[in-house]
C-alpha cells in the first residue's frame, strides 16, 4: 500500500525533525486549541426548518472518546405554520474528522489514525425529481 | 487526556491515560473517503439556505485542504425563489481534529489540532428580541 500524503511534504526536512521508525509517525495528542468553543447561534437544531437531534457515541479506545452525531428529525421540512412539508427534504450535512484508535494485541498497544464521517446538522433542500419515461 | 481501562496484566506505563505522544501507523483508516463537498452532493445549491465554498489550504496541516461554507444570503430562499428576510441563513459549525506538522515542515511528526469549520448552512426562525 502507498503511504498517504500525510507523510509527504515538498519542504526540505529540517535537521530538528525527530527520528521516526519507518511506516509510522510521531503524534502529539496534546490538542492545540483544546479550549476553543463552538459559537453557533443558540439552539439552531430546534429553530431550523430542518431540525435535528444529537446522539453521543462513546468509545474508550478512541480519542476523542465522545463523538456527537446529528440525525434529522423529519423527512420533510417545517413550514411557516410549524407543519412538516414533504415537498421539501431535510438532509444531513456531513464533515470528516480525524480520530486516534487504540488497538490492544495482548499487552502491546498500537495506534491508528482513522477518518470518521460526522453528521453535523441538517439543511432543507428542494428534492431532485426523477421523471420516469 | 482521557482515562482508558487497561489490562491489569500489562506492564505499567508512564501514564495511565492516553499517552501524550504516540507512534501512529502512517496508513490512515478510511482515508480514501471523499473529501470534496462539491463532489459528494449538491446540497449547497439546492438548500433554502444555500452556501458558497471557500478553499482553505495549508501545507503544514493534514488534510491540507479544508472546504469552508459561507452562507450566500442573510435570509432564506422561499418557494418563489426569492430571499425571505423573515428567516435567517446560519452556518452549521463543527470542531474537527486535524494534524499540524510539529516541528514545522517535518514530514512524519504531528500534533493534533482542533479547528472550527463551517460545514454548511441551515435556515432558522430568528430570535426576536422584544424591547420593553
Amino acid at each position: 500500500r502507498k503511504i498517504p500524503k500525510v507523510g509527504h511534504t515538498f519542504f526540505q526536512k529540517p535537521e530538528s525533525c525527530p527520528p521516526v521508525p519507518g511506516g509510522s509517525m510521531k503524534l502529539d495528542i496534546g490538542i492545540i486549541n483544546e479550549n476553543q468553543r463552538v459559537s453557533m447561534s443558540r439552539n439552531i437544531e430546534s429553530r431550523s426548518t430542518s431540525p435535528w437531534n444529537y446522539t453521543v457515541t462513546w468509545d474508550p479506545n478512541r480519542y476523542p472518546s465522545e463523538v456527537v452525531q446529528a440525525q434529522c428529525r423529519n423527512l420533510g421540512c417545517i413550514n411557516a405554520q410549524g407543519k412538516e412539508d414533504i415537498s421539501m427534504n431535510s438532509v444531513p450535512i456531513q464533515q470528516e474528522t480525524l480520530v486516534v484508535r487504540r488497538k490492544h494485541q495482548g499487552c502491546s498497544v498500537s495506534f491508528q489514525l482513522e477518518k470518521v464521517l460526522v453528521t453535523v446538522g441538517c439543511t432543507c433542500v428542494t428534492p431532485v425529481i426523477h421523471h420516469v419515461q | 487526556g482521557i482515562t482508558i481501562p487497561r489490562n491489569p496484566g500489562c506492564p505499567n506505563s508512564e501514564d495511565k491515560n492516553f499517552p501524550r505522544t504516540v507512534m501512529v501507523n502512517l496508513n490512515i483508516h478510511n482515508r480514501n473517503t471523499n473529501t470534496n463537498p462539491k463532489r459528494s452532493s449538491d446540497y449547497y445549491n439546492r438548500s433554502t439556505s444555500p452556501w458558497n465554498l471557500h478553499r482553505n489550504e495549508d501545507p503544514e496541516r493534514y488534510p491540507s485542504v479544508i472546504w469552508e461554507a459561507k452562507c450566500r444570503h442573510l435570509g432564506c430562499i422561499n418557494a418563489d425563489g426569492n430571499v425571505d428576510y423573515h428567516m435567517n441563513s446560519v452556518p452549521i459549525q463543527q470542531e474537527i481534529l486535524v494534524l499540524r506538522r510539529e516541528p514545522p515542515h517535518c514530514p512524519n511528526s504531528f500534533r493534533l489540532e482542533k479547528i472550527l469549520v463551517s460545514v454548511g448552512c441551515t435556515c432558522v426562525t430568528p430570535i426576536v428580541h422584544h424591547v420593553a
Epitope: - | N52, L53, H54, R55, E68, K70, R72, L74, Y85, S89
Partner: nanobody, 117 residues
C-alpha cells in the same frame, strides 16, 4: 440590526492604491459570502469580487483580476478590498454586501473612489 459601513475611498492618481474597509454589525461577516460591488455614474451596479464561490475560488471581475484583493478579518468583523494599479475606469462608488443579496435594505452608503490625474 444588520449594518454595513464602507470607508477608505478617496481621490487617487492612476497607478495608485487604496484599501477599502467594510465594517459589519448585527451579524458575523466571516460566516457569509461577502463581496464588493461598484457603480459608476450612469452605469449598472457590477460585482467586483466575492470572497467565496460555488467552486471554492475567490471571484474577481475580469477588469480587476491581478490588481484587486479581497480579504476578511474575522476578529474585527471587517472585509477589505485592496486596490492596486488603479485606473480611471475604476472610478465609482464602492459598496459591500453579501455576494448574492440584492436586497438594498442591507447595503451601506458606499464609499467614493475617484481615479484621476
Amino acid at each position: 440590526e444588520v449594518q454595513l459601513v464602507e470607508s477608505g475611498g478617496g481621490l487617487v492618481q492612476p497607478g495608485g492604491s487604496l484599501r477599502l474597509s467594510c465594517a459589519a454589525s448585527g451579524f458575523t461577516l466571516g460566516y457569509y459570502a461577502i463581496g464588493w460591488f461598484r457603480q459608476a455614474p450612469g452605469k449598472e451596479r457590477e460585482g467586483v469580487s466575492c470572497d467565496s464561490s460555488s467552486d471554492g475560488d475567490t471571484y474577481y471581475a475580469n477588469s480587476v483580476k491581478g490588481r484587486f484583493t479581497i480579504s476578511t478579518d474575522n476578529g474585527k468583523n471587517t472585509v477589505y478590498l485592496q486596490m492596486n494599479s488603479l485606473k480611471p475606469e475604476d472610478t465609482a462608488v464602492y459598496y459591500c454586501a453579501t455576494c448574492t443579496d440584492w436586497n438594498y435594505d442591507y447595503w451601506g452608503q458606499g464609499t467614493q473612489v475617484t481615479v484621476s490625474s
